[in-house]
């Protein structure tokens, strides 16, 4: 089964993306309180870099990560290959699906999270996440985040 | 219009086979992960089956493990059930699911 493509350019992710929910096949030590809007600026060679701001336990996390192209459409590595990333698109319009596998905190983890260009959440989208969680094997509750667009330590 | 039609229910004796498959229109197919649920009479509907849209990763509820199989064909537009050595307790109505959209059901009776 072919990945879908998502085109030869990554233009098409750029931009500001809403983290709507995530999950993973195990608990996730920290969980966030709220996040700010995922920016993805497309970079030469095809390669993206990702920002984001969580508020975990009233500490505001700053994250930048690099997600580096790869001959496969839509696959990436991150921290120096020791994670894998895969961005396709849902059905549902401006909506995206990130899924990843490879170490966080010293152990294997394999998480998704749902990306979309508007704040509101879309029952259509997050079913088709539900689902897509559910394939994979992901079986912790999944997590419908706060939106902010800014953060702000000790409160939202 | 998006739409999600299930065929190749019947009745069938234990120990036998069946292949449910649903087409489903209206949406782009291939983006979309499908599941396979079912309901049996005077019980809440439970989740048999799932399959990715990225990979075609499957997963099963336990009770099915080793007996069903879910796949699918992009082209055309078909997700798959095969149920094999069927039991009494797999006595339902099979749905098809795809996001928040579920199909009418067909019906599997597995009796001697």
């Known amino acids: 089964q072919d990945t879908p493509a998502l085109g030869k350019d990554t233009v098409a992710v750029s931009g500001k993306w809403y983290l709507k929910a995530m999950t993973a096949d195990q608990e996730v030590p920290e969980k966030p309180d709220s996040v700010t809007p995922m920016i993805l600026k497309a970079q030469k060679g095809g390669n993206l870099e990702a920002k984001i701001t969580m508020l975990t336990n009233g500490q505001c996390q700053n994250i930048t990560v690099v997600l580096h192209k790869t001959s496969e459409p839509g696959k990436y590595t991150a921290y120096e290959g020791q994670r894998v990333v895969f961005i396709q698109p849902s059905p549902v319009r401006d909506h995206y699906i990130l899924y990843c596998e490879g170490e966080l905190h010293g152990r294997q983890i394999r998480m998704a999270k749902l990306l979309g260009r508007d704040p509101e959440q879309s029952q259509e989208a997050l079913e088709d996440f539900r689902e897509f969680s559910r394939a994979k094997g992901l079986n912790q509750e999944i997590l419908e985040l706060a939106q902010s667009e800014t953060c702000s330590p000790g409160g939202q | 219009q998006l739409q999600l039609v299930e065929s190749g229910g019947g009745l069938v004796q234990p120990g036998g086979s069946l292949r449910l498959s649903c087409v489903g229109s209206?949406?782009?197919?291939?983006?979309?992960?499908m599941g396979w649920y079912r309901q049996a009479p005077g019980k809440e509907r439970e989740w048999v089956a799932s399959i990715s849209s990225l990979d075609a990763s499957t997963n099963y509820a336990d009770s099915v493990k080793g007996r069903f199989t879910i796949s699918r064909d992009n082209a055309k537009r078909m997700v798959y059930l095969q149920m094999n050595n069927l039991k009494s307790e797999d006595t339902a109505v099979y749905y098809c699911?795809?996001?928040?959209?579920w199909g009418k059901g067909t019906q599997v009776t597995v009796s001697s």
């Open positions: 209206g949406f782009t197919f291939s983006l979309a992960s």
């Open positions: 699911k795809a996001m928040n959209y």
